[in-house]
């Protein structure tokens, strides 16, 4: 997911709604003006704010990355909701990445739970009933190119 940073607003466009702050705070979907006199609406699909705030800028909407699908779009009061695409899950130790789910179980084990966007398929021992988290990679990621002389052009 692209990092949420503050999205510097341009000078408020005429179509941006303005209202007055209440006790120095602006409502969700707005940010406060530099002089503190106005509440300026966030731009739909571009930025948002979720709570009463005194932010000078609304928060920039998250863009789902190439490994994700958009569950719900960004509104002025709620950020985009992204989820790992079908067949992938978000690892706890690498939350920015969606990894392929295992499609099978190790020998001697059977499926306990299916792959979801939040966790890998879980397997259980046929005999003991011991769970296997599926976190052990089904495939290695040590990098080498395949052997053999490629028919490759020189760059």
């Amino acid at each position: 997911i692209t990092q949420q940073d503050l999205a510097p607003q341009q000078r408020a466009a005429p179509q941006q709604k303005r209202s007055s702050p209440s006790e120095g705070l602006c409502p969700p979907g707005h940010h406060i003006s530099e002089d503190g006199r106005d509440c300026i609406s966030c731009k739909y699909g571009q930025d948002y704010s979720t709570h009463w705030n005194d932010l000078l800028f609304c928060l920039r909407c998250t863009r789902c990355d190439s490994g994700e699908v958009e569950l719900s779009p960004c509104t002025t009061t709620r950020n985009t909701v992204c989820q790992c695409e079908e067949g992938t899950f978000r690892e706890e130790d690498s939350p920015e990445m969606c990894r392929k789910c295992r499609t099978g179980c190790p020998r001697g084990m059977v499926k306990l739970t299916s792959c979801t966007p939040r966790e890998n398929r879980k397997c259980v021992s046929k005999t003991s009933g011991t769970k296997h988290s599926g976190e052990v990679p089904a495939v290695e990621e040590t990098v080498t190119s395949s052997p053999g002389t490629p028919a490759s052009p020189c760059s």
Partner: antibody, heavy 118, light 107 residues
Framework: EVQLQQSGAEVVKPGASVKLSCKAS????????IHWVKQAPGQGLEWIGR????????KYDPKFQGKATITTDTSSNTAYMELSSLRSEDTAVYYC???????????WGQGTLVTVSS | EIVMTQSPATLSVSPGERATLSCRAS??????LHWYQQKPGQAPRLLIK???QSITGIPARFSGSGSGTEFTLTISSLQSEDFAVYYC?????????FGQGTKLEIK
């Protein structure tokens, strides 16, 4: 050991089609993504598209939509790419590439040179 | 699509020296930037993933940095086998795109 063994060089006539193969060993392709990348002679790398062999879902660079069709046969652990309506600018080395994550490419095949010539 | 621009196109460095290669994205890609090395007649190989994460089997002299739109690949002390073409690639949005490459040659 992880390997991606690609089919041999092809010489094809303009307008024809060609189907390249990529046989995987040392892993199950259903547990990965398979991408294809083009490299024209003396040029850089161009991403063509990707398939998730577990469900057949594909994504393509719009410039290769209609030109390339990526498929897999999970029973033989093999990926394929068919290139249609070939022209001289399709002359290139085509690499099949693996990724445990979609975002980057951790193992590369040796490449298949396709030459389009009348 | 996101355009990746690498500089310089060619870099001449002496063995043992440090090499710094740059890659710029036309819009923010967070840290979703990956580096590859390609030697003549060979397939590329992955050097660095997610801008700065090392890859098993890749020498420690290769390191990466950057986020957003500006990225750098550094080779701390060049060995003879490091002279090759280096590509950056963004995986943040479709379609995936590569830089045009930087050729690292012996000075």
């Amino acid at each position: 050991e992880v390997q991606l063994q690609q089919s041999g060089a092809e010489v094809v006539k303009p307008g024809a089609s060609v189907k390249l193969s990529c046989k995987a060993s040392g892993f199950n392709i259903k547990d990965t993504f398979i991408h294809w990348v083009k490299q024209a002679p003396g040029q850089g790398l161009e991403w063509i598209g990707r398939i998730d062999p577990a469900n057949g879902n594909t994504k393509y660079d719009p410039k290769f939509q209609g030109k390339a069709t990526i498929t897999t046969d999970t029973s033989s652990n093999t990926a394929y790419m068919e290139l249609s309506s070939l022209r001289s600018e399709d002359t290139a080395v085509y690499y099949c590439v693996r990724g445990l994550y979609t975002y980057y490419f951790d193992y590369w095949g040796q490449g298949t040179l396709v030459t389009v010539s009348s | 699509e996101i355009v990746m621009t690498q500089s310089p196109a060619t870099l001449s460095v002496s063995p043992g020296e440090r090499a710094t290669l740059s890659c710029r994205a036309s819009q923010s890609i967070s840290n979703n930037l990956h580096w590859y090395q390609q030697k003549p007649g060979q397939a590329p190989r992955l050097l660095i993933k997610f801008a700065s994460q090392s890859i098993t089997g890749i020498p420690a002299r290769f390191s990466g940095s950057g986020s957003g739109t500006e990225f750098t690949l550094t080779i701390s002390s060049l060995q003879s086998e490091d002279f090759a073409v280096y590509y950056c690639q963004q995986g943040n949005s479709w379609p995936y795109t590569f830089g045009q490459g930087t050729k690292l040659e012996i000075k």
